[in-house]
């Protein structure tokens, strides 16, 4: 399987909410040994191999925003502790997941990266992961809402097995 | 190393513009954000705004409203910040900072030009 | 603007004394966890120098007898012992709403 980016930039105005998205491409086994581990964490613009290293979200971990669930499975992180941090992951049956950030600030801006992991039972596990840039606005230039702009087909099957 | 060489001091007369140079070495360009600061004489430190050198989108203290603009040139790991309508109390010495982290937008500074001082006088 | 209001606005010091300077925001400069304060030092015709970010992280290079506490509105620098090439202006900072704002810096002089 491949992970998608539909866009590789958002561009945000300060104070709004934004859903940054991944998809699952590719066939999925949806046997009873296979479970997927999906998660978002932020990283540095100027590694050689994108999305190597992780960095927290908000001060969260990939471990507080990750979803654990079979197959396309729809899945949701637990509420307390991502909401508190304005945070929350999702997954629905379509391949599609995504992590919702409200009230961005200047801070919010940078790299995020999507990651999901193929798990077998008793077998060795597949990484692929998708990276993307959010840019939060102030002032003048800020748009009034965000504004996205699609990955070239290059980009958009993003993957890169760990 | 990590430097950031700003160009030489302007003189101008009120109504005029100033472009201030600060050209970037020692780490990836486009990885970290450009800030600017500027510092009237005997006064304490004012944030203009930033530039993503990665977007080459900027964004400006509302102070400024229209009349700064910040660019940049990734041929020559360059950013520009221009000031127009100067009037006197534009005189200040005006600095570049690089943003801390190459992750996010954080206005906090380890690295600065050596200052431009800019000079508005009729 | 978040409003920075530092003090005292001049200290002097004898060589080897404690010093501290206090720093009040406006309103909380918390970032889910972090706070985003920071301190430097300008001496005479130089760009500052970072001392602490994130209120009490202690810049790389920089002594330890620099110290940064607090969190939500109000932030201290202490420094241990005053050393002469402490001389300076010190301005603290908040990067966490735009427009970034500084203190109104504080003069330490050697007595």
């Known amino acids: 399987f491949k992970v998608a980016t539909p866009y590789s930039l958002y561009v945000c105005p300060e104070g709004q909410n934004v859903t940054l998205t991944c998809r699952l491409l590719g066939p999925v086994d949806k046997g009873h040994d296979v479970t997927f581990y999906k998660t978002w964490y932020r990283s540095s613009r100027g590694e050689v191999q994108t999305c190597s290293e992780r960095r927290p979200i908000r001060n969260l971990t990939f471990q507080d925003l990750h979803l654990h669930h079979g197959g396309h499975q729809a899945a949701n992180t637990s509420h307390d502790l991502a909401q508190r941090h304005g945070l929350e992951s999702a997954s629905d049956h379509h391949g599609n997941f995504s992590i919702t950030m409200r009230n961005l600030t200047l801070l919010d801006s940078g790299l995020y990266c999507c990651l999901v992991v193929e798990i077998r039972h008793h077998h060795s596990e597949h990484r692929v992961h998708g990276a993307m840039e959010l840019q939060v606005q102030t002032g003048k230039d800020a748009p009034s809402n965000c504004v996205v702009y699609p990955s070239s087909s290059q980009d958009s099957e993003n993957i890169t097995a760990a | 190393q990590v430097q950031l060489v700003q160009s030489g001091a302007e003189v101008k007369k009120p109504g005029a513009s100033v472009k201030v140079s600060c050209k970037a070495s020692g780490y990836t360009f486009t990885s970290y954000w450009m800030h600017w600061v500027r510092q009237a004489p005997g006064q304490g430190l004012e944030w203009m705004g930033y530039?993503?050198?990665?977007?080459?989108?900027?964004g400006y203290n509302q102070k400024f409203k229209d009349r700064v603009t910040m660019t940049r040139d990734t041929s020559t790991s360059t950013v520009y910040m221009e000031l127009s309508s100067l009037r006197s109390e534009d005189t200040a010495v005006y600095y570049c900072?690089?943003?801390?982290?190459?992750?996010?937008?954080?206005?906090?500074?380890?690295?600065w030009g050596q200052g431009t001082t800019v000079t508005v006088s009729s | 603007d978040i409003v920075m209001t530092q003090t005292p606005l001049s200290l002097s010091v004898t060589p080897g004394q404690p010093a501290s300077i206090s720093c009040r925001a406006s309103?909380?400069?918390?970032?889910?966890?972090?706070?985003?304060m920071q301190w430097y030092l300008q001496k005479p015709g130089q760009p500052p120098q970072l001392l602490i970010y994130?209120?009490?992280n202690v810049e790389s290079g920089v002594p330890d007898r620099f110290s940064g506490s607090g969190s939500g509105t109000d932030f201290t620098l202490k420094i241990s012992r005053v050393e002469a090439e402490d001389v300076g202006v010190y301005y603290c900072?908040?990067?966490?709403?735009?427009?970034?704002?500084f203190g109104q810096g504080t003069k330490l002089e050697i007595k």
């Open positions: 309103e909380s400069v918390e970032y889910y966890g972090t706070s985003l």
């Open positions: 530039i993503n050198p990665s977007t080459g989108y900027p």
């Open positions: 900072q908040q990067s966490r709403k735009v427009p970034s704002t």
């Open positions: 994130a209120a009490s």
């Open positions: 900072a690089r943003s801390y982290y190459d992750y996010d937008g954080g206005a906090w500074f380890a690295y």
